[in-house]
């Protein structure tokens, strides 16, 4: 009786989002599963998701460690189930991932608008400073806590009754922008991080317009 | 080749500590998982936990959690189970395993056997 | 937990006669492993991943099944292959062994 045949995997693919990690490849196993490993440039491959069925493994305990590192995978691939086999010979076929440096590489969330306040012909709109899965001191960072200063934020707003938008700009969490007094305005942001080469910006957020729930508005 | 070879067999009292070793060779340690098992006499076998050498990372089974302390300590390559508040429960032959190809618990070493009497 | 229920708990066999044990679990798993253990030695990984047999084991034995139905057969008993032997799983956490069967030679 021979061994069975197994398929290396092909197409590793880093999914990541404000951190959270998924590495996703290709062929859906037949008669085979995949134990995946992950190792920076100087450690050791550490084993993760052992022989699963499943293309993806979720690789962000492993990289929330240091989002700074630069991180490499692999997918190890094994006969297995009902299949003709005879022992095991050598070492399984394996295929790497590219390298992952999540500091640099992990997309920004989708942001929202936490909330916005007028204050006669101030508008104050706050970001919602979103939960990451990085952990310091047994307590979850924020993303403004990872990122600092590298991360800016975008506001793209505009009178309801018109379709010319203005930007602001703010390191922080929070724009203080003026307004025309009477007027309901629209808002969306979108995260930057701008000192960087790809996944430079996220998508923008919902469009949040004074007048409804989230709003605040004071006649001053 | 990969060998686990672990400390000689303990007798112990009731209430007390005990913990047990195993030194690796013919491998990178801090590379691999590392299981303990424990087997009591004439019965079958018990996953207790693990421990992945290169970083400390470590999972146990909830019945043991409180009961078993896995370390590892690199510079020897030597991996640790302390068991505390001993009973004639825990008499038993305990193994180190380590995972390897095809399966988590390819390799063994040879138990040891942990007898608790007052 | 899965729990693993293996039968015969006892069983003997002549040399030469075909030899089938089987492991039920308590709930669907997705590949069972078998382990060899003789007295006062360790177990030793017999088969992998359902049907893969481990290195240096024998061509008489096989592994088969899927779901909640699992087992072992040995085409022609032989006195080295008397043991006890081991199912295990770990598609859930924690992995869990069977009672294990004892395999007697006649």
């Known amino acids: 009786s021979g061994t069975t045949n197994t398929v290396a995997a092909y197409n590793l693919t880093w999914k990541s989002t404000n951190f959270k990690t998924i590495l996703e490849w290709e062929p859906k196993p037949v008669n085979q599963v995949y134990t995946v490993q992950i190792s920076t440039k100087s450690g050791d491959w550490k084993s993760k998701c052992f022989y699963t069925t499943d293309t993806e493994c979720d690789l962000t305990d492993e990289i929330v460690k240091d989002v700074k590192q630069t991180y490499l995978a692999r997918v190890f691939s094994y006969p297995a189930g009902n299949v003709e086999s005879t022992g095991s010979a050598g070492e399984p076929l394996y295929e790497n991932s590219p390298e992952f440096t999540p500091y640099l590489e992990t997309n920004l969330g989708q942001p929202t608008i936490q909330s916005f306040e007028q204050v006669g012909t101030k508008v104050n709109v706050t970001v919602e400073d979103e939960r990451t899965l990085v952990r310091r001191n047994n307590t979850f960072l924020s993303l403004r806590d990872v990122f600092g200063k590298d991360l800016i934020y975008t506001l793209y707003y505009w009178k309801s009754s018109s379709s010319g938008k203005k930007t602001a700009k703010t390191n922080t969490n929070e724009f203080l922008i003026d307004v025309d007094k009477g007027e309901n305005y629209c808002f969306s942001v979108q995260a930057v991080i701008p000192s960087r080469t790809v996944n430079r910006k996220s998508t923008d957020s919902p469009v949040e317009c004074m007048g409804q729930e989230k709003g605040e508005f004071r006649e001053i | 080749q990969v060998q686990l070879q672990q400390s000689g067999a303990e007798l112990v009292r009731p209430g007390s500590s005990v913990k047990i070793s195993c030194k690796a060779s013919?491998?990178?340690?801090?590379?691999?998982?590392m299981y303990w098992v424990k087997q009591r006499p004439g019965q079958g076998l018990e996953w207790i936990g693990q421990?992945?050498?290169?970083?400390?990372?470590?999972n146990y089974n909830e019945n043991f959690k409180g009961k078993a302390t896995l370390t590892a300590d690199k510079s020897s390559s030597t991996a640790y189970m302390q068991l505390s508040s001993l009973t004639s429960e825990d008499s038993a032959v305990y193994f180190c395993?380590?995972?390897?190809?095809?399966?988590?618990?390819?390799?063994w070493g040879q138990g040891t056997l942990v007898t608790v009497s007052a | 937990q899965i729990v693993l229920t293996q039968s015969p708990a006892l069983m003997s066999a002549s040399p030469g006669e075909k030899v089938t044990m089987t492991c039920s679990a308590s709930?669907?798993?997705?590949?069972m492993y078998w382990y060899q253990q003789k007295p006062r030695s360790s177990p030793k990984p017999w088969i992998n991943?359902?049907?893969n047999l481990a290195s240096g084991v024998p061509a008489r034995f096989s592994g088969r099944g899927s779901g909640t139905s699992y087992s072992l057969t040995i085409s022609s008993m032989e006195a080295e292959d008397a043991a006890t032997y081991y199912c295990?799983?770990?598609?859930?956490?924690?992995?869990?062994f069977g009672g294990g069967t004892k395999l007697e030679i006649k």
């Open positions: 295990q799983q770990w598609s859930y956490n924690p992995p869990t």
């Open positions: 395993t380590r995972e390897g190809y095809g399966n988590r618990f390819a390799y």
């Open positions: 013919g491998y990178t340690f801090s590379s691999y998982w």
């Open positions: 709930s669907s798993v997705s590949y």
């Open positions: 421990i992945y050498p290169g970083d400390g990372d470590s």
């Open positions: 991943l359902t049907s």
